[in-house]
Every structure is written in structure tokens, then in C-alpha cells.
């Protein structure tokens, strides 16, 4: 277990031309707050996918009113860190989304209005326990400067917060086989690993794999509170309490999640899954409306005039998703030729070509015959990214270098004998047969069963069957 910490240093106009308009005015003073969303791994997930590692909201910053005529300065920031606790191991690689929100403090009906000013995202590698990492991200004309780190909560240590440390039992050294815990040299690495999911607050173990409950808690993972009040249906004794056990109020009883959020119990307490447009531990941060500009990539927002009504993003060509944050798969049109593999890289389509083809769409058939000589009078034939030789009579093989044996297939019928010849083969026929392949019997009366004479030949003319 541990905590990811984010420190915002500044949020203001980025360098270069086109400074953004101040988000606040004398008529509409405002203040900023930030939201961070963390996801494990380096996958570039959609903005709407769950913050699987956790999320946090900052406090509101000081109220800011624009000074007329003055350039937009760095805007006043909320105090303190944004802290995202993580229960399991720190993954080492993570994706983040940091959103800058504006809260307008005018006299609008229904309380303050929120709008999203900027959203930055990135993917990073970070070891727990390391120093603060500094970063600068730009979103349009805005620039956000921040630092972040991951630190383990005792007794966890290590780059993934998976090693446990306990105070030394003896002042001089650790027990057999146990190492001192850097950087906490006065502590020893703990070999005990309790049952997976055992509550770190209400459970403990003295043997690996067990989960023993502190007083007032029960269940296999010590996550269920118990009551010692009298009860009608005893649930059995407990070493911690006398009488009977009655499950106490569950963390989701009465549904602490506002705005239609759904509650699920966690080993520590509860977790709210908020409907689109609501944030916060209990989904208490107000709904996003079209005024907040929730549609990315030029999407057109329709509906959602007030936080109670849903908005719909009509996405421009090439984008989709509930906030137009996803690209359409353009490869489904199969633009690559000659069996090339299509890759949609976002900024462009790429084709990975099969051997023998090239070009942006694999449209060029490489000259397979270039520099490929076919021996012995053979001719090169291109096709399908590979060359092939059409060999002269009497030769074979890939490059026509092998002398073909025309007699190998035993072409002479009826016991005729085959002789290789420069122009092919010659059959010496057995008695009673004739023809180029000895295929025609000679009839006893002297007539032959030759096929009808071709035009221009009279029966009896000598015929060459070669």
C-alpha cells in the first residue's frame, strides 16, 4: 500500500503567441481546482475509462478576479498535495490524466458552475520511494507544471511497496534470514505475508497466510464490523467478544454515493462508481454540462443544458466515443494493397508490406527479376513478390541450372525405350506400336490406328511426333 502524491506548481499561459483569455473576469470571479486520474500500465486508455489506480480532487484555490488589461498570469492554486492512495502494489508504470477545472462564483442560479479548462495526459515509469519527478505538460495555450512521486505507507517498502518492515525485536540485529529495511535501518524486513486481501487496519497475522481480526471486526478478511448487542439469532462466539455477533452497518448501507452513483464495498470502506459527469469520493462534484466543453476533437455537444440532463457528443468525422476521444478504425477500408498489413497510427495510416512490395500502400511490385539471370536460355517471370524462371527445354530448377531428364517420367508407352535428345526426347517403340510416345498400336493388316490426318497432310505422309 502507498500514496501517489501530486504537487501542482503552476497553471497559466504557455510560451509562444496566442495567450489564452483569462478564465475569470471582474463580472465572473472564479477559482481553480484539479482532478487527477491514475491507471496502471502504459496503455493509452480513453479518458472515460475507470481510474483503476485511483483518483483525487484538490481543494478549491483562492478566488481570482482578472485585472482588466493585464495579461493572464499564472493562476492562484489550491494549497496542498493531491493524494491518491493505492491499496495494492505500485505498478511501476502508469498513465495519468490531470484536469484543471474552473469554478465560477457569479450569481448564477443553482450555485456555482464548473467547466473543464484543460486536460493533460501522459504515461510514465516511476519507482515508489524515489525522489519527486518534475514535469511540464501543455494543453492548447495553457501550461501545467507539476511534480509527482509514489511513496509506500509503513510497513510497506520497496520500489513496488510489496516488502514489509517491522520494528526490530532485538536492538542489535534482525532475526535469522531477515535483512535490515533500507532506508529504515532500525527496522527489519518482515517475512510474514498475511492472507491476500486481509484488512490492513483491522486484521493481522502471526503465521503466513492467516488473517486474524482485531476486536470489533470479523469475516475471513476482517472487513465486517461486529456488534455485541443482544440478538435474536446467535451467530456463534468470538474470541474478541462475548455473546453473539451481529453484522454491523455495512459501509454501503444507505448508499453514500450521490447523484445516482453505485456503491461497492472495499476492504477499507466503500467505493462509488459515478455516472458520467459526476466526480468525487461520493459523486458529489456537480455534473458536466455542454458549457463545460466535454466533447473532444471538435465534437458538437447537444443537450445537457443543466447537470440533471445528459449531454451527447456528436463527433466529427474520424472520431467516436462518448466524448469523441477515440479514433475510428480507418483500416477497416483495407487501403493496403498486395496483402499489406494496415496500421492506424492516429496521425497517419501505415502499411506494412509483404516481401516483394513497397510504397506507402504497398502499391509497387518490386522488380523481382532485376539482377536475376535464368541460366541456359530461361526467361524470368515476375509475380507475387517472387521471381520464377521459365526454363528452356531440357533444363529445370529455380534458375534453370539443372539439366532436366526428360525420360524421368517414363513417357514412352507400351514398353517403348526413351532416349534424351537435345530437342526433347525420342521414343524407340516396341514391335507393334508407333507414334511419338508409342501410343498407337499397329494393326495386323498393316493399317495403323493413327488419328485422322491433320489438314494439309495426306494419309501416308511421314509424321514427326516430337
Amino acid at each position: 500500500a502507498g500514496v501517489f502524491e501530486l504537487q501542482i506548481h503552476s497553471f497559466g499561459p504557455g510560451p509562444g503567441p496566442g495567450a489564452p483569455r483569462s478564465p475569470c473576469s471582474a463580472r465572473l470571479p472564479c477559482r481553480l481546482f484539479f482532478r487527477v486520474c491514475l491507471k496502471p500500465g502504459l496503455s493509452e486508455e480513453a479518458a472515460e475509462s475507470p481510474c483503476a489506480l485511483g483518483a483525487a480532487l484538490s481543494a478549491r484555490g483562492p478566488v481570482y478576479t482578472e485585472q482588466p488589461g493585464a495579461p493572464a498570469p499564472d493562476l492562484p492554486l489550491p494549497d496542498g498535495l493531491l493524494q491518491v492512495p493505492f491499496r495494492d502494489a505500485w505498478p511501476g508504470t502508469f498513465s495519468f490524466i490531470i484536469e484543471t477545472w474552473r469554478e465560477e462564483l457569479g450569481d448564477q442560479i443553482g450555485g456555482p458552475a464548473w467547466s473543464l479548462l484543460a486536460r493533460v495526459a501522459g504515461r510514465r515509469r516511476l519507482a515508489a520511494g524515489g525522489p519527486w519527478a518534475r514535469d511540464i505538460q501543455r494543453a492548447g495555450a495553457w501550461e501545467l507544471r507539476f511534480s509527482y512521486r509514489a511513496r509506500c505507507e509503513p510497513p510497506a517498502v520497496g520500489t513496488a511497496c510489496t516488502r514489509l518492515c517491522r520494528p526490530r525485536s532485538a536492538p542489535s540485529r534482525c532475526g535469522p534470514g531477515l535483512r535490515p529495511c533500507a532506508p529504515l535501518e532500525d527496522e527489519c524486513e518482515a517475512p510474514l505475508v498475511c492472507r491476500a486481501g486481509c484488512s490492513p487496519e483491522h486484521g493481522f497475522c502471526e503465521q503466513p497466510g492467516e488473517c486474524r481480526c482485531l476486536e470489533g471486526w470479523t469475516g475471513p478478511l476482517c472487513t465486517v464490523p461486529v456488534s455485541t448487542s443482544s440478538c435474536l439469532s446467535p451467530r456463534g462466539p468470538s474470541s474478541a467478544t462475548t455473546g453473539c455477533l451481529v453484522p454491523g452497518p455495512g459501509p454501503c448501507d444507505g448508499n453514500p454515493c450521490a447523484n445516482g452513483g453505485s456503491c461497492s464495498e472495499t476492504p477499507r470502506s466503500f467505493e462509488c462508481t459515478c455516472p458520467r459527469g459526476f466526480y468525487g469520493l461520493r459523486c458529489e462534484v456537480s455534473g458536466v454540462t455542454c458549457a463545460d466543453g466535454p466533447c473532444f476533437n471538435g465534437g458538437l455537444c447537444v443537450g445537457g443544458a443543466d447537470p440533471d440532463s445528459a449531454y451527447i457528443c456528436h463527433c466529427p468525422p474520424g472520431f467516436q466515443g462518448s466524448n469523441c476521444e477515440k479514433r475510428v478504425d480507418r483500416c477497416s477500408l483495407q487501403p493496403c494493397r498486395n496483402g499489406g498489413l494496415c496500421l492506424d497510427l492516429g496521425h497517419a495510416l501505415r502499411c506494412r508490406c509483404r516481401a516483394g512490395f513497397a510504397g506507402p500502400r504497398c502499391e509497387h511490385d518490386l522488380d523481382d527479376c532485376a539482377g536475376r539471370a535464368c541460366a541456359n536460355g530461361g526467361t524470368c517471370v515476375e509475380g507475387g513478390g517472387a521471381h520464377r524462371c521459365s526454363c528452356a527445354l531440357g533444363f529445370g530448377g529455380r534458375d534453370c541450372r539443372e539439366r532436366a531428364d526428360p525420360c524421368a517420367a517414363r513417357p514412352c508407352a507400351h514398353g517403348g525405350r526413351c532416349y534424351a535428345h537435345f530437342s526433347g526426347l525420342v521414343c524407340a517403340c516396341a514391335p507393334g506400336y508407333m507414334g511419338a510416345r508409342c501410343e498407337f498400336p499397329v494393326h495386323p493388316d498393316g493399317a495403323s490406328a493413327l488419328p485422322a490426318a491433320p489438314p494439309g497432310l495426306r494419309p501416308g505422309d511421314p509424321q514427326r511426333y516430337l
Partner: nanobody
Framework: EVQLVESGGGEVQPGGSLRLSCAAS????????MGWYRQAPGKQRELVAG???????KYAESVKGRFTISRDNAKNTVYLQMSSLRAEDTAVYYC??????????????WGQGTLVTVKP
Amino acid sequence: EVQLVESGGGEVQPGGSLRLSCAASGSIFSINAMGWYRQAPGKQRELVAGFTGEGSTKYAESVKGRFTISRDNAKNTVYLQMSSLRAEDTAVYYCAADVQLLNSDYEFYWGQGTLVTVKP
């Protein structure tokens, strides 16, 4: 720059027909692939029909036998003849083209979309 201009969308009753047209213009050297996608509210955009880079035609399973794609190479135009229309064909239909530009680069372009509504 290349423009794709769609036309022919509208409202039709179930079982009816519509013909969509998409004309490409601009600094086009050749059109490598061209076709029609559609996107219904809350759904992913999907390819309906198209001419692939190889020149073959490709259809979504749900429209086979009902929709026919054709083209006029001289006009750089593709057509989508839609018949036996169903309520589930209601969507914004987008023309898409993979174009080889005069500078020999390839770029993928989208039209602005035309709405097809099928309702009794």
C-alpha cells in the same frame, strides 16, 4: 486539400430506398480506397461498404444483399444504393477516402456526414 461532399440522405419509411452520393474534389492524383461508414447514436462507427485498395468491394454483414456500392472513376464519385431499409439503418453516413495527392502523399479524408432516418 481534398473535399468529400455527401448528398442523398433523408427520411424514409421501412422497406424504402435511398441513394447516397459522395464526390471527391481537390488536389487528387488518384483514389486508393473509398467507401461509406455509418454511426448511430451511442454506437461505434462502422464500415458499411467500400472499395478497398485492391479494388474489391467490401460490405458489412448487416447490409449484404440490401446495399450496393458503385463508383464513377471519371467523376471521383462513389454511390451507395440502399434498399429494403430498416430502422436499425438509421445513422449518420460518412464518406471516407484514402487519397493519393498530387505530391504523391497518401491522406485519409472524411466527409461531413449525411443523416439517414428510417421510421414509419
